[in-house]
């Protein structure tokens, strides 16, 4: 039998064992988080699958993910939301220690999809393990990009109190308007619920005394946030290694001096 013709995309294909991975992650998450015990993981997988299976992978909409978003509804306590941009690993290390703060990937839907790739094909029930659309080279309305845009928007919309964001001080654009944080989350914080955004600018491994809160891109972020009637604060984290160490052991005498 000749293999059926399959669309060739520029991006890597669906992560191997994708359905099993999503289902296993869901089961694990609901076991660890008592408030999500009511979630039926088979229904979650069905809703996830329904968002992209049999659909042309360059024509996915936020609407496609609404059934999944509904099943994964979760709230973060006020003052406990941590957003991040281009510095995922440190943000996750932080919330692993500071257990009462949450990134999107600490929530069910973010946890399910973190580091995974997926896409289907128009008019077939197959998952494409060979290739998926690349955001730049193929299209932006692909299953993965639309998923993260959808859940990031929701995560920002539900945030309240003081929201924190971790930004990478080693990038040329510390705040990048084209990142998910800059293009989605910033614009979906609700001024009636969010009093302030506090940016933590994480310095690279090299020692430095410069105040990166004075960076032009941070000033741009401040301007965007202030125009939305949300207060803005910025802190330099000069020593990320010490920062994490002091989150773990705040009583440590060396934590009285700067981080």
């Amino acid at each position: 039998v000749l293999p059926r013709w399959r669309q060739q995309w520029s991006g890597s294909g669906t992560t191997s064992r994708f359905p099993e991975t999503v289902l296993a992650r869901c089961v694990k998450y609901t076991e660890v988080h008592p408030e999500m015990r009511h979630v039926d993981c088979q229904s979650v997988w069905d809703a996830f699958k329904g968002a992209f299976i049999s659909k042309y992978p360059c024509n996915i909409t936020e609407e496609d993910y609404q059934p999944l978003v509904k099943l994964g509804t979760q709230t973060v306590p006020c003052n406990k939301t941590l957003l991040w941009s281009r510095i995922k690993d440190l943000a996750h290390q932080f919330t692993q220690v500071q257990r009462d703060m949450f990134t999107l990937e600490d929530m069910l839907l973010g946890y399910l999809a973190d580091d995974l790739t997926w896409c289907g094909e128009f008019n077939t029930f197959e998952i494409n393990y060979q290739s998926c659309p690349d955001w730049r080279k193929d299209c932006s309305n692909n299953p993965v990009s639309v998923f993260w845009k959808t859940v990031s928007r929701r995560f920002a919309e539900t945030a309240c109190g003081v929201v924190h964001v971790m930004l990478n001080g080693s990038r040329s654009k510390i705040f990048d308007k084209n990142s998910t944080f800059g293009s989605v989350e910033v614009h979906n914080l609700q001024p009636e619920k969010v009093q302030a955004l506090e940016a933590w600018v994480i310095h690279g491994g090299r020692e430095d005394s410069r105040d990166l809160c004075q960076d032009p891109t941070i000033k741009e972020l401040e301007s965007i946030i202030s125009k939305r009637n949300i207060r803005f604060f910025c802190k330099n984290i000069y020593r990320p290694d010490k920062f994490l160490q002091c989150v773990k052991n705040p009583e440590d005498s060396s934590c009285l001096s700067g981080i």
């Epitope: 040329s172 090299r206 020692e207 005394s209 960076d215 000069y238 020593r239 001096s257 981080i259």
Partner: antibody, heavy 119, light 112 residues
Framework: QVQLQQSVSELRSPGSSVKLSCKDF?????????MSWVRQKPGHGFEWIGD????????FYGEKFEDKAKLDADTVSNTAYLELTSLSSEDSAIYYC???????????WGQGTLVAVSA | DIVMTQTPLSLPVGLGDQASISCRSS???????????LHWYLQKPGQSPKLLIY???NRFSGVPDRFSGSGSGTDFTLKISRVEAEDLGVYFC?????????FGGGTKLEIK
């Protein structure tokens, strides 16, 4: 040994511009080390103009020099540049480039470029 | 901007003597990252400055141990335990705790 080599002296008339260069012979550290420019005027001591981190092009200027100086760097030739505009006699000085040795510490200095502005 | 004030302006010393130069900043140089970015440079006639001491008390590579630095907050001192002929020149303190980096006016070390 010479680590930073600066361009030769420049004589300019008021109102003109000049672009000074500073070649770093340590190609490994150049992209990821801030390069500062400092000027020394007789009787005025040293003034920090600004610095640039070549690999990402991040620049800090001293407030006094924001409209006077333009910093640039080329990571292919490992060369930093300082352009001075609207020159006046007040800008006559020796201009040094200095690469940081550790974070925020000027450890290695070029030999300096004398800029003389005269009608 | 932080103002760095050095004293004395001129310091005549005999070879083998101890020399002491003071540097005072207009505000504390203790940075929020826990470091104090106060440094000392020597500029010999016709040459560019050379780093001697960084972050108050650390000798830069190749700097003889007769040079030492001390101080905290706003008051700092450079000591040369036994002055040699090659030590003559102008000594500058500098801070890089707060932008813009600023420099002291210099202290000229000369033979008595």
């Amino acid at each position: 040994q010479v680590q930073l080599q600066q361009s030769v002296s420049e004589l300019r008339s008021p109102g003109s511009s000049v672009k000074l260069s500073c070649k770093d012979f340590d190609s490994e550290v150049f992209p990821t080390s801030y390069m500062s420019w400092v000027r020394q005027k007789p009787g005025h001591g040293f003034e920090w103009i600004g610095d640039i981190l070549p690999n990402i092009g991040r620049i800090f200027y001293g407030e006094k020099f924001e409209d006077k100086a333009k910093l640039d760097a080329d990571t292919v030739s490992n060369t930093a540049y300082l352009e001075l505009t609207s020159l006046s006699s007040e800008d006559s000085a020796i201009y040094y480039c200095a690469r940081e040795a550790y974070g925020s510490i000027l450890g290695y200095w070029g030999q300096g470029t004398l800029v003389a502005v005269s009608a | 901007d932080i103002v760095m004030t050095q004293t004395p302006l001129s310091l005549p010393v005999g070879l083998g003597d101890q020399a002491s130069i003071s540097c005072r900043s207009s505000q504390s140089l203790l940075h929020s990252n826990g470091n104090t970015y106060l440094h000392w440079y020597l500029q010999k006639p016709g040459q560019s400055p050379k780093l001697l001491i960084y972050k108050v008390s650390n000798r830069f590579s190749g700097v003889p141990d007769r040079f030492s630095g001390s101080g905290s907050g706003t008051d700092f001192t450079l000591k040369i335990s036994r002055v040699e002929a090659e030590d003559l020149g102008v000594y500058f303190c500098s801070q890089s705790s707060h932008l813009p980096w600023t420099f002291g006016g210099g202290t000229k070390l000369e033979i008595k």
